[in-house]
């Protein structure tokens, strides 16, 4: 058993039929010695008396809020949560496996630049009685500070018969140098509690590997005189690290006809302009990627030829 | 190739072309190592990230773009003195910091070159003949060092009398390649920045 936060405890249980469970001793936080009784949740049934209560925790029915009283007055609470281990593996029932970039990916994180700011998100089908708490650090043995905000519900989607909820959190490394060469990864730890079930999820990454620039901005077309060609131009996104001559981007330019069956023409360029043959109903799209370290491409910025 | 590769435009900062070749060569070599050594811990997640230049050179700090020198987190630099001549400075009025930066890059390349050559000598003795260092990568390191053209004592190649542990050598190769790729990214960023300024 260990303390998650004040008056909240996690009991780690090997979860299999007829498992013996864990013996837990609860102590009432009071100077009183006599006349103390214990109850569980809203029940008025007295479970025991005395300053300490010994219980055998085997299943969710044994978890919950234990309260010690004296003469009708509440003295203290202890909330017991269960963390299940099945076949040596901690349960992952609360969050959905996103399977990207690989199986057993519950947390996904992205950064728009090298400032040390990043966003992580996760998915669940659970809508109520759910809380998350997020901690992060750079490295684990001698951790350096990363500050995370509160996790918030950021999107709701319908997937078949199920509703899916996306939660996200923003974190910022306390003292980040955009030009630094990372040798210790960022660690992100999410504590998830659904009713009386506790689970934890972790992710470890280098900022350089989770970079995904915002799409290029101000994508514009300028017709060229006496020609069916247009000059396409765009700019670095505002959120990208500066100076741009140091943090350079490469761009992918794509021309797509009206019909999806038409072959796309696609090419890479380091410049922020290109000349394009713009046919009626075609569209031009541009996306960005770090020029020197190939992490994710941005989403496309698009403009119609008409 | 049908014709000898054309030299880059002489108006261009002379080292940019070489640094782009370096990043491509080390990225290709790392990809090859990850494929060939698929049953060894050779991915970014599996290896320990070591920097053989740590406390010996200060490339990141010495090559910091001016715009980032106001960022306190970037300024934990170590005082290091380097020789300050070099042909990448080609007829430009360069600051002391730029010379320091380029000489730090040169020292990095020299240290990696020695490590890679020593390692290659060991890998050549491996009866499995599983992996060797790409000669193109070694040549590109050499070309960039020549373009930087700093005078510096030659470091003798490390020789070892004991029987090499090929498993450890291959893991060390992965560690070195990952670290060198990260440094090659920094070098490319620096050359691009200097070319623009």
């Amino acid at each position: 058993i260990w303390e998650l936060k004040k008056d909240v405890y996690v009991v780690e249980l090997d979860w299999y039929p007829d498992a013996p469970g864990e013996m837990v001793v609860l102590t009432c936080d009071t100077p009183e010695e006599d006349g103390i009784t214990w109850t569980l949740d809203q029940s008025s049934e007295v479970l025991g008396s005395g300053k300490t209560l010994t219980i055998q925790v085997k299943e969710f029915g044994d978890a919950g809020q234990y309260t010690c009283h004296k003469g009708g007055e509440v003295l203290s609470h202890s909330l017991l949560l269960l963390h299940k281990k099945e076949d040596g593996i901690w349960s992952t029932d609360i969050l959905k496996d996103q399977k990207e970039p690989k199986n057993k990916t519950f947390l996904r994180c992205e950064a728009k630049n090298y400032s040390g700011r990043f966003t992580c998100w996760w998915l669940t089908t659970i809508s109520t009685d759910l809380t998350f708490s997020v901690k992060s650090s750079r490295g684990s043995s001698d951790p350096q500070g990363v500050t995370c905000g509160a996790a918030t519900l950021s999107a709701e989607r319908v997937r078949g018969d199920n509703k899916e909820y996306e939660y996200s959190v923003e974190c910022q490394e306390d003292s980040a140098c955009p030009a630094a060469e990372e040798s210790l990864p960022i660690e992100v730890m999410v504590d998830a509690v659904h009713k009386l079930k506790y689970e934890n999820y972790t992710s470890s990454f280098f900022i350089r590997d989770i970079i995904k620039p915002d799409p290029p901005k101000n994508l514009q077309l300028k017709p060229l005189k006496n020609s069916r060609q247009v000059e396409v131009s765009w700019e670095y996104p505002d959120t990208w690290s500066t100076p741009h001559s140091y943090f350079s981007l490469t761009f992918c330019v794509q021309v797509q006809g009206k019909s999806k069956r038409e072959k796309k023409d696609r090419v890479f360029t380091d410049k922020t302009s290109a000349t394009v043959i713009c046919r009626k109903n075609a569209s031009i799209s541009v996306r960005a990627q770090d020029r020197y370290y190939s992490s994710s491409w941005s989403e496309w910025a698009s403009v119609p030829c008409s | 190739r049908n014709l000898p590769v054309a030299t880059p435009d002489p108006g261009m900062f002379p080292c940019l072309h070489h640094s782009q070749n370096l990043l491509r060569a080390v990225s290709n070599m790392l990809q090859k190592a990850r494929q060939t050594l698929e049953f060894y811990p050779c991915t970014s997640e599996e290896i320990d990230h070591e920097d053989i230049t740590k406390d010996k050179t200060s490339t990141v700090e010495a090559c910091l773009p001016l715009e980032l020198t106001k960022n306190e987190s970037c300024l934990n630099s170590r005082e290091t003195s380097f020789i300050t001549n070099g042909s990448c400075l080609a007829s430009r009025k360069t600051s002391f910091m730029m010379a320091l930066c380029l000489s730090s890059i040169y020292e990095d390349l020299k240290m990696y070159q020695v490590e890679f050559k020593t390692m290659n000598a060991k890998l050549l003795m491996d009866p499995k003949r599983q992996i060797f260092l790409d000669q193109n990568m070694l040549a590109v390191i050499d070309e960039l060092m020549q373009a930087l053209n700093f005078n510096s004592e030659t470091v003798p190649q490390k020789s070892s009398l004991e029987e090499p542990d090929f498993y450890k050598t291959k893991i060390k190769l992965c560690i070195l390649l990952h670290a060198f790729r990260i440094r090659a990214v920094t070098i490319d960023r620096v050359m691009s920045y200097l070319n623009a300024s």
């Epitope: 060609q229 330019v253 072959k263 023409d265 090419v267 394009v276 | 072309h17």
Partner: nanobody, 124 residues
Framework: EVQLVESGGGLVQAGGSLRLSCAAS????????MGWFRQTPGKGREFVAA????????DYANSVKGRFTISRDNAKNTAYLQMNNLKPEDTAVYYC?????????????????WGQGTQVTVSS
């Protein structure tokens, strides 16, 4: 393996036009970005223009923008450079090059295959 042969060079007066052709052998022509470079004595090879595999996206050196047009015909395995309003400073040997990296405007060193070049002379 791709073999490239340029043609169409020659002597022309300032203000005149020329059309260079680059014929490629090999079935994979449409997989290569095609570029034109030029070289004057004692100078490095200078980028002129490049065109994407599908022929719809191109890039030009500032010095030729609005005067030169690059195009390609994948059915004929040929790339073209239409040069209008030629100036004496356009005098050079023009090379056609092929690049599998699918990059429009990288340096000459990134092109895998080169033609032998065709001389263009613009007299004033």
């Amino acid at each position: 393996e791709v073999q490239l042969v340029e043609s169409g060079g020659g002597l022309v007066q300032a203000g005149g036009s020329l059309r260079l052709s680059c014929a490629a052998s090999g079935r994979t022509f449409s997989a290569y970005v095609m570029g034109w470079f030029r070289q004057t004595p004692g100078k490095g090879r200078e980028f002129v223009a490049a065109i994407s595999t599908g022929g719809q996206i191109s890039d030009y050196a500032n010095s030729v923008k609005g005067r030169f047009t690059i195009s390609r015909d994948n059915a004929k395995n040929t790339a073209y450079l239409q040069m209008n309003n030629l100036k004496p400073e356009d005098t050079a040997v023009y090379y056609c090059a092929a690049n599998r990296e699918n990059f429009l405007n990288r340096g000459a060193g990134d092109y895998e295959y080169w033609g032998q070049g065709t001389q263009v002379t613009v007299s004033s």
